[in-house]
């Protein structure tokens, strides 16, 4: 019976068996619902919306890493509908903490204003360099510098959303 079907299965009335929901392709996310025994009649997939990506399957599209606004890093590879963005070295005025375990967001660049003396990325950096950083036009993420208390809970930003 359909109550025995799994998270991504629906009950096929014809065969009397649980059947896999049709998975979405890369760059798509589910439209309507399927799983735990039920499937909407028009269940299907839609392309990922702005600034999100998906590897396919049953996952909703996730936000690209915000290299500049959140990580304070350069963009090595911009994301597309099928791939996340890849971040490069820190932006001018920011540095990477050495020998620090990665947090749940990966490596984050920190302001040179907070750097120990003689930090190589910060030598010659002006104090103003870290005060101005690029943001996402028209929409915003919450950065660990603005909302450090939210970083630990996994809420309030978009690095892995």
């Amino acid at each position: 019976e359909y109550s025995n079907c799994g998270e991504n299965e629906y009950y096929n009335q014809t065969t009397g068996l649980c059947q896999e929901c049709p998975p979405c392709g890369p760059g798509e996310e589910p439209y309507l619902s399927c799983g735990y025994g039920t499937k909407d009649e028009d269940y299907g997939c839609v392309p990922c919306p702005a600034e999100k990506f998906s590897k396919g399957g049953y996952q909703i599209c996730r936000r690209h890493k915000d290299c500049e606004g959140f990580f304070r890093a350069t963009v090595l590879t911009p994301g597309d509908m099928e791939n996340d963005a890849e971040c490069g070295p820190c932006l001018p005025g920011y540095y990477m903490l050495e020998n620090r375990p990665r947090n749940i967001y990966g490596m984050v660049c920190y302001s040179c204003l907070l750097a120990p003396p003689n930090t190589k990325e910060c030598v010659g950096a002006t104090s103003g360099a870290s005060a101005n950083f690029p943001g996402t036009s028209g929409s915003s993420t919450l950065s660990p510098f603005q909302h450090a208390h939210k970083e630990l809970s996994g809420q309030g930003h978009l690095a892995t959303a």
Partner: antibody, heavy 115, light 107 residues
Framework: EVQLEESGPELVKPGASVRISCKAS????????MHWVKQGPEKSLEWIGE????????IYNQKFEAKATLTVDISSSTTYMQLKSLTSEDSAVYYC????????WGQGTLVTVSA | DIVMTQSPSSLSASLGDRVTISCSAS??????LNWFQQKPDGTIKLLIF???SLHSGVPSRFSGSGSGTDYYLTISNLETEDVAIYYC?????????FGGGTKLEIK
């Protein structure tokens, strides 16, 4: 059947805050982003932001970043939006709507800001 | 932000008519366009997603078309229940933005 049930109307004083809710049912809550949309008296629609219940990730329209705070309670499949420092400009109907094409919408919550 | 301009802002048509509503984006939106219907009681429903895909349960007299910056919602064989305000919405670039709406009335 998928349903998005929003909380009831609110009458609040200028400068105060209000929290409205959107309770989802009929689908796996953590599988979709939840969006919030504002409709002012002139009837135009404005996208406020969205929250991913599975990660807590949030995207705001910059225009509303200082005004709205989105949160989620997975245990009750409910998304919340808090609006702060309210003025008459915030008097509007607020809708929640689900990602994946925006196929489902709540019935709307009327917020009236008046002294 | 991408500006979505709808036209006309209001229109009156007769039962059985074919009606077309236009939506113009300030830049290309690559077919990332939805159409919504808002009934007089405030209820909002998705009609068309991704320019031309008909949402589940929506009558086939509704259709969507367009590309680049110009998009269209067509209602053929207008019925009384189609009295509503219609909105387009782009989701090509954040923040997602809506058109100003088109109020459809029956003559």
């Amino acid at each position: 059947e998928v349903q998005l049930e929003e909380s009831g109307p609110e009458l609040v004083k200028p400068g105060a805050s209000v929290r409205i809710s959107c309770k989802a049912s009929g689908y796996s809550f953590t599988d979709y982003w939840m969006h919030w949309v504002k409709q002012g008296p002139e009837k135009s629609l404005e996208w406020i932001g969205e929250i991913n219940p599975s990660t807590g990730g949030i995207i705001y329209n910059q225009k509303f970043e200082a005004k709205a705070t989105l949160t989620v309670d997975i245990s009750s499949s409910t998304t919340y939006m808090q609006l702060k420092s309210l003025t008459s400009e915030d008097s509007a109907v607020y809708y929640c709507t689900r990602s994946g094409g925006f196929p489902y919408w709540g019935q709307g919550t009327l917020v009236t800001v008046s002294a | 932000d991408i500006v979505m301009t709808q036209s006309p802002s209001s229109l009156s048509a007769s039962l059985g008519d074919r009606v077309t509503i236009s939506c113009s984006a300030s830049q290309g939106i690559s077919n990332y366009l939805n159409w919504f219907q808002q009934k007089p009681d405030g209820t909002i429903k998705l009609l068309i997603f991704y320019t031309s895909s008909l949402h589940s349960g929506v009558p086939s007299r509704f259709s969507g078309s367009g590309s680049g910056t110009d998009y269209y919602l067509t209602i053929s064989n207008l019925e009384t229940e189609d009295v509503a305000i219609y909105y387009c919405q782009q989701y090509s670039k954040l923040p997602y933005t809506f058109g100003g709406g088109t109020k459809l009335e029956i003559k």
